[in-house]
């Protein structure tokens, strides 16, 4: 039975050209995390494997940095980075848990005025 829950940084906004940290945390389960996949829409951004460590997809290696922890740092943000991001926790024996973050990348002047998502 899957008892765990994933907490995320929620719905966030960031400034064009800046950086953002995507964070997920799996709680309420004793299952072993074997791998965490980070996806943007249907594209794989990065993998953190418990045994093999981090792998960043070649097409994102210039703008994606591993960490902190099991999180992911996106750099040199563009408006095209707006969208959904998923953290997919592969665990044993529970199975797969998925968390979702929606990122809006704002023009600098908008971001400076504190536009933020409302967390549901």
């Amino acid at each position: 039975m899957m008892t765990g829950t994933i907490e995320t940084t929620g719905n966030i906004s960031a400034e064009k050209g800046g950086s953002i940290i995507l964070q997920c945390h799996l709680s309420s389960t004793t299952a072993q995390v074997t791998q965490v996949n980070w996806e943007q829409q249907d594209q794989l951004l990065a993998i953190c494997n418990a045994d093999l460590g981090w792998h960043i997809s070649p097409s994102f290696k210039d703008r994606v940095a591993p960490g902190p922890g099991l999180g992911l740092t996106l750099q040199s943000l563009t408006v095209n980075d707006t969208g959904e991001y998923f953290c997919i926790y592969h665990t044993y024996p529970d199975g797969t848990y998925t968390g979702r973050i929606f990122l809006e990348v704002l023009e600098s002047s908008v971001a400076e005025h504190g536009a933020r998502f409302q967390i549901p």
Partner: nanobody, 125 residues
Framework: QVQLVESGGGVVQPGRSLRLSCAAS????????MGWFRQAPGKERESVAA????????YYADSVKGRFTISRDNSKNTLYLQMNSLRAEDTAVYYC??????????????????WGQGTLVTVSS
Amino acid sequence: QVQLVESGGGVVQPGRSLRLSCAASGPSFSSYPMGWFRQAPGKERESVAAQSSDGRFTYYADSVKGRFTISRDNSKNTLYLQMNSLRAEDTAVYYCAARDSGSGYYSRAQWYDYWGQGTLVTVSS
């Protein structure tokens, strides 16, 4: 409880257009992120398009980009999918889905709370 009813499906020749509608019951339609999904015979359900509750954010699957347009009319509690340049591979049952609340669009089926019964689109010459 939200009820979703799709309409507008049918048989159409390749290259032609169709517009699907999804009528929603419920008082808070304007707060629902919504999406269109489809399932072809013998295949898994896949996302087609999705839109945030305020219409600011839109998602399209790569296979329909530039051909399909999702839109909504909050005054009519209706979601639309305009499908142009239809292809045989677009043949499927199309489902409308809604989520109670949330920010941005939701491209994956697991996040939706309510589903319609579907409308069949057949693209054939």
